[in-house]
Amino acid sequence: DVERTTCPPEKEVHEIDESLIFYKKRELEACVDAALLAAQMDRVDAIPFTYEQLDVLKHKLDELYPQGYPESVIRHLGHLFLKMSPEDIRKWNVTSLETLKALLKVSKGHEMSAQVATLIDRVVVGRGQLDKDTVDTLTAFCPGCLCSLSPERLSSVPPSVIGAVRPQDLDTCGPRQLDVLYPKARLAFQNMSGSEYFVKIRPFLGGAPTEDVKALSQQNVSMDLATFMKLRREAVLPLTVAEVQKLLGPHVEGLKVEEQHSPVRDWILKQRQDDLDTLGLGLQGGIPNGYLILDLSVREALS
């Protein structure tokens, strides 16, 4: 922490300007008034303060705004944003997409995924929902950031906005997030023809239930293996060999490459070996011929 000293009269700061780069940390602490700093935040990012000097300026703002910075300050944080922790950002109320854009630009190239995720969360809360303008801003300035939102926040996405989401925006989404987004995508694309529908829905299929995957297998979609590997394990396990063959079409040969990886490995273990043999891929690990499978979970549910 910076030691408290009194400011010599000749060092008193009446405006935030470039000469402050020469102020030692203790001089900044003593001579820069927090209210002046907040009022002239728009000047701060034009001044190449060292990161240690920025620590001092942050400390001053923290003291002035213990409950969180106002958006007028947040908008102009610039490189000072790099000093913020997720805990700091959680105190903010952000509604302006211009503020979001400015801070996303600053964070580029820095390891700030937790801070950015928290910032986006605050924007969604501040705006009330994840509207089209917000999604457009995220896809333009922070590809992949959509997936930093919690499933609860993603549930506020109206289906009408889903069309603005690009495949690469979903690359880092986990199963719980896709569980939320998939039904919205299904609704958004429901009036499209078979092939067009599949192209649109494909990035969201990690959230699809078994019945929808089964339905796709009847539509000659020739699902690529990368998409198949992202399907929920629970959605893949009930599929028959014939259904998987129809679903993948010419891509079925890729199962051999993924034989040891989930969900393919788990699916193989549930299939009869003689059914697997019909694929002619040499897949091993299915249920040997002549064995009877008892699903005890069903019996327990009945008793």
Partner: nanobody
Amino acid sequence: EVQVVESGGGLVQAGASLRLSCASSGRTISPIAMAWFRQAPGKERELVAGLTWTGRTYYSDSVKGRFTISRDNAKNTVYLQMDSLKFEDTAVYFCAAGDNPDRRGSSWSSSSVYEYWGQGTQVTVSS
């Protein structure tokens, strides 16, 4: 690559004046900061005066009111006018230029911030 060359040092009586010059070459854009540091025997290098790319100045407490830093853009030269010299001003004076793109260091008063340095010029003030 920026080259920095100081001149103007010498031996003077206490109370006299000297003007140090720092000629820089090697690029057309002004560095973010030009500064004069000094180092007395057995002591750390300390900032004497600094000048930003916009012309703002800064002086250490020990020289404020006696020293003036200025620049002649046409000649790519920074000056340090030293008046009312004291015995304590005796040191090797260094000119430094820096951009500090990584924003390292505690402040621009720290010598670690500057990428380009001259060889230094000796100033000796006799009492």
